[in-house]
């Protein structure tokens, strides 16, 4: 079965800067990736970025730069200040829509013990079957 992994990293240089990396471990063709925070998209979460493999990117503050890393993984840099700034216990979720598997979503946050500059290993987070 497909899996989604989520990795959250706080940058050592800026404590309000986070990098989220997400990947899809499956054989299908990805049609859309949605990154959200505060919970799964559509379940109280707020969309940070939407990435289409051909048509491009839409992103929303405090997202600074979303991009495809490979055909099956993306990264998103967040830079916030004040109310729009992520904090250490913020949950980030990535939802991959793929054919023929459907939609798969996983969430992750910064590990409690992480020092700035460290990150969680990119292991699959609990998988939520969306569709």
């Amino acid at each position: 079965t497909p899996e989604v992994w989520v990795q959250v990293r706080m940058e050592a240089t800026e404590l309000s800067s986070f990098t989220i990396r997400c990947g899809f471990l499956g054989s299908g063709s990805i049609s859309l990736v949605t990154v959200s925070w505060g919970g799964p998209n559509g379940a109280g979460g707020t969309t940070l970025a939407v990435l289409h493999p051909e048509r491009g990117i839409r992103q929303w503050a405090p997202a600074r730069q979303a991009r495809w890393e490979t055909q099956s993984s993306i990264s998103l840099i967040l830079e916030g200040s004040g109310a729009s700034s992520p904090c250490a216990n913020t949950t980030f979720c990535c939802k991959f829509a793929s054919f023929p598997e459907g939609s798969w979503e996983a969430c992750g946050s910064l590990p409690p013990s992480s020092d700035p500059g460290l990150s969680a290993p990119p292991t699959p987070a609990p998988i939520l079957r969306a569709d």
């Epitope: 707020t46 048509r55 491009g56 929303w60 503050a61 730069q65």
Partner: antibody, heavy 119, light 107 residues
Amino acid sequence: EVQLQQSGPELVKPGSSVKISCEASGFTFADYNVDWVKQSHGKSLEWIGAINPNDGGTSYNQKFEGKATLTVDKSSTTAYMELRSLTSEDSAVYYCARWVNNDWYFDVWGTGTTVTVSS
Amino acid sequence: DIVMTQSQKFMSTSVGDRVSITCKASQNVRSAVDWYQQKPGQSPKTLIHSASNRHTGVPDRFTGSGSGTDFTLTISNIQSEDLADYFCLQHWNYPYTFGGGTKLEVK
């Protein structure tokens, strides 16, 4: 008919601010994002930023952060862009445009607002 | 930032002719390119989205092609009303960027 009607021309002094509007009609405002584009005289187009009417979420071209502030009023189906600390470099025509989320493009453009900064 | 280069600033053509306007991206932007037409004193109008999809109501004389870094807008059977500036736009990455424009003159 789908329309984006923008406010009229503005003649403003250097250092001041201006707020221009983009009133949407003929469609469900919340179903589309509104982006803003600058066209300096005789020049090409520059993307300023976007706003999502549903939650007021914004995205800016870094070049315009601190210069432009995007807001919406859902009740009047109107998007606004405020430009601050104006200089002659800000003299331009500003357009709003409707972004189609499912198809990923601007399908309708506003009428344009000319801003002239002069003492 | 991704640079969109329209190397032809001006193009001259005659009614009934066919012309190709090109746009080159500084990096691979897949098919995330649109084409817009702007007639003198008017707002831009959408012609082509996602490199090759014609916008509703746009005559089939307008055709978009290309992917990756090289894109072309072809106008066949040129009409006098096609006198305009033509711009490409990439929305593959932030910030979105436009080409410098190509002004089409119809003799």
